[in-house]
Interface confidence: low
């Protein structure tokens, strides 16, 4: 570590005196910073010497010496005071620039350490500091304004009490710059716009920045628009607003509008699309199939997307039948607005009952007229089966009726013994009816089919079973011939 002679850390001299500062190290040494012309600098072996024959108040400052070859990078310093009764201050810089919330050093150095007790900081021409100005003083460095604020960017003077009167330094201008975190904040409203040809429209592009130095413009497709700019300042931010007002829109006004703002940190842009239409429109669509099938007892949401301009004047869900005159519970209908011109309407149908199958229509109206979208809801049912013994054209016949949706298919089984249901081990014969007769097939209702098994004689210790199944489930009915006629068994519940 280098050593300075005299040993310091402070040296007080009078104006006109000769001052010699010698720095000695193990290797070569050098003095930091720019050395004013009043000093003579020469090397003497491993030492470097600063000398002046005529010290002035302007030589007041800290002198630091370093040894470049020292791996520890040590340095030594001495602070020189040139005690001038007429010049209590040596101002090193007339302008200081800092960012907001940084400490601002106003480098007015006291030329006489004895004066430290009577120093103060004032604004130009002795005006007091702004309230909440938090500062401290160091005789070696000057005044420090802590966490400087933008509003504290002012002209300051350092004041010292000499012989009962205040002596001011020359002024120091402090510039406090706002910290610009990024490009200006932008808003472009509306985010999307639709107008009918001939209507009025307004697009507002606004940008805000913490500093006044920024630009904003509105662009239509690739054309930069010449629009008067309104400026404002609120919430500690500078605002610039461009308002495009169109009294009567036409198709050439349609297209992409971009709001672009820039500052020293860069550029920020946001866009919106303006659509001009010939007349009012109202479009209904669904991502779902309009023909829906759901198993009885389950739930379903019917969803309709609406695009409309002008806005909707009314909308509702209606049940069109055929089973009852009930109408959808309003609590089951839900509306969400995706954006200004797009909406989603949902009808929730929980635990569907047989009487709730049928047509559901969503109707909406705007000045363009009415539109409707109709869903057809069919319920799926597992088959229900019954078997009766009858005589057809003198022949004994087993008649199986199966009812369900989708249409059930029918299989007959003959098995040994008397049983409520044939299991695989007992099965003697299987007949599949490829084309059972359809007895009824009404929209939104179960399909009822009938299958006949003609038998001249039914063997008494055997069971005949009719089985029906569809995509939802299956059902069966067992028939056991007995001497007194016949008896049947429905399946176990």
């Amino acid at each position: 570590i280098p050593v300075i002679e005299p040993s310091g850390p402070e040296l007080v001299v009078k104006p006109g005196e000769t001052v010699t500062l010698r720095c000695v190290g193990n290797g070569s040494v050098e003095w930091d910073g720019p050395i004013s012309p009043h000093w003579t600098l020469y090397s003497d072996g491993p030492s470097s010497v600063l000398t002046t024959n005529n010290a002035t108040f302007q030589n007041t400052r800290t002198y630091r010496c370093t040894e470049p070859g020292d791996p520890l990078g040590g340095s030594a310093a001495i602070h020189l005071y040139v005690k001038d009764p007429a010049r209590p201050w040596n101002v090193l810089a007339k302008e200081v620039v800092v960012f907001e919330d940084q400490d601002a050093l106003l480098p007015c150095l006291l030329t006489d350490p004895v004066l430290e007790a009577g120093v103060s900081l004032v604004r130009l021409r002795g005006r007091p500091l702004l309230r909440h100005t938090n500062y401290s003083f160091s005789p070696w460095h000057g005044f420090i304004i802590h966490r400087a604020k933008f509003i504290q960017g002012q002209d300051y003077q350092c004041s010292a009490l000499m012989g009962g009167r205040k002596v001011m330094s020359i002024s120091i201008r402090l510039k406090v710059q706002k910290v610009i975190p990024g490009p200006p904040a932008l808003t472009l409203v509306p985010a999307e716009l639709v107008r009918i040809r001939g209507e009025a429209a307004q697009i507002v592009c606004s940008a805000s920045n913490i500093d006044v130095d920024f630009d904003v413009f509105l662009q239509h497709n690739t054309t930069k628009l010449a629009i008067p700019q309104r400026s404002d300042f609120h919430d500690n931010r500078y605002q610039k607003v461009l308002t495009l007002s169109l009294g009567q829109v036409d198709f050439q006004h349609a297209g992409n509008y971009s709001c672009v703002a820039s500052n020293v940190q860069g550029k920020h842009s946001t866009s919106m699309f303006f659509q001009v239409v010939e007349s009012a429109y109202l479009d209904l669509s669904s991502e779902q199939n309009l023909i829906q099938e759901v198993t009885v007892g389950e739930g379903l949401n019917l969803k309709v997307m609406v695009e409309a301009y002008p806005g909707l004047q009314g909308f509702n869900w209606t049940y069109l039948g055929p089973f009852s005159d009930h109408q959808p519970e309003p609590k089951l209908a839900n509306a969400t607005t995706k954006d200004t011109y797009r909406h989603t309407f949902t009808l929730s149908l929980p635990r569907l009952k047989p009487s709730e199958a049928g047509r559901y229509s969503f109707l909406a109206r705007n000045p363009g007229g009415w539109r409707a979208l109709t869903f057809e809801l069919t319920l799926r049912y597992p088959p229900e089966v019954s078997v009766i013994w009858t005589s057809i054209n003198g022949s004994g016949t087993l008649l199986c009726a199966a009812s369900g949706y989708p249409q059930p298919n029918v299989t007959w089984l003959q098995c040994a013994g008397h049983t409520d249901r044939c299991d695989e081990a007992q099965v003697l014969q299987v007949w599949v009816d490829p084309h059972p007769e359809v007895l009824s097939q009404e929209p939104f209702q179960k399909v009822t089919v009938q299958s006949l098994l003609t038998a001249e004689t039914l063997e008494h210790n055997q069971t005949y079973e009719c089985r029906a199944h569809n995509s939802v489930g299956s059902g069966s009915w067992a028939f056991i011939p007995i001497s007194a006629g016949a008896r049947t068994h429905p399946p176990d519940e």
Epitope: I196, G198, E199, A200, A201, Q202, S245, G247, Q248, S279, A280, P310, R365, P367, G368, G369, W370
Partner: antibody
Framework: QVQLQQSGPELVKPGASVKLSCKAS????????INWVKQRPGQGLEWIGW????????KYNEKFKGKATLTVDTSSRTVYMEFHSLTSEDSAVYFC????????????WGQGTLVTVSA | KIVLTQSPASLAVSLRQRATISCRAS??????????MHWFQQKSGQPPKLLIY???NLESGVPARFSGSGSRTDFTLTIDPVEADDAATYYC?????????FGSGTKLELK
């Protein structure tokens, strides 16, 4: 071009009703409201109401509710205004006028129908 | 109900001079930057004719000597210069709120 052709003058007795017509041509009939406006001799203009031909919906000035009934026949592109229980106060010229969406001005007018209520 | 008060009730203007007609609304109205105030001209025995729509827009085919201005509650129709054909009654009308209402009219005569 857009035209609104109104029916001819009417001379009616107090207490009777009168049905005026306004036939539209030259534009998509169902897209625009048809308004009716009353003007008494030497007086100003008074809005009666509008009918929306697409679905027959109406909007009336409260003052004329029950007095006027607005209907539309889209097949003949004709709008009707029936005025009931006529008194001498109903003697006036009645105009039909086309407007577009809410806020649009009455850009096209019929020539007017003079109704005279007299015993 | 918005009441529109026109002034003056009548005025006489020399040819090639300026005519100014005022229309004051009983309450301020403005909708999305649109001012639904319109001006009509009516000559004896004829239906009204649209001159200005939305306060300041000139209807197609109307001479440029007609102009409209104003916002909120105070609106003005200006004819400059007046021509012989402009002798008529002028009405303001608001389409902002039901019931739609007209001003009482201003009769323009030529000196």
């Amino acid at each position: 071009q857009v035209q609104l052709q109104q029916s001819g003058p009417e001379l009616v007795k107090p207490g009777a009703s009168v049905k005026l017509s306004c036939k539209a041509s030259g534009y998509t009939f169902t897209t625009y409201d048809i308004n009716w406006v009353k003007q008494r001799p030497g007086q100003g203009l008074e809005w009666i109401g509008w009918v929306y031909p697409r679905d027959g919906s109406t909007k009336y000035n409260e003052k004329f509710k029950g007095k006027a009934t607005l209907t539309v026949d889209t097949s003949s592109r004709t709008v009707y205004m029936e005025f009931h229980s006529l008194t001498s106060e109903d003697s006036a010229v009645y105009f039909c006028a086309r407007s577009g969406l809410t806020g649009s001005p009455f850009a096209y007018w019929g020539q007017g129908t003079l109704v005279t209520v007299s015993a | 109900k918005i009441v529109l008060t026109q002034s003056p009730a009548s005025l006489a203007v020399s040819l090639r001079q300026r005519a100014t007609i005022s229309c004051r609304a009983s309450e301020s109205f403005d909708s999305y930057g649109n001012t639904f105030m319109h001006w009509f001209q009516q000559k004896s025995g004829q239906p009204p004719k649209l001159l200005i729509y939305r306060a300041s827009n000139l209807e197609s085919g109307v001479p440029a000597r007609f102009s409209g201005s104003g916002s909120r509650t105070d609106f003005t129709l200006t004819i400059d210069p007046v021509e012989a054909d402009d002798a008529a009654t002028y009405y303001c009308q608001q389409n902002n709120e039901y019931p739609l209402t007209f001003g009482s009219g201003t009769k323009l005569e030529l000196k």
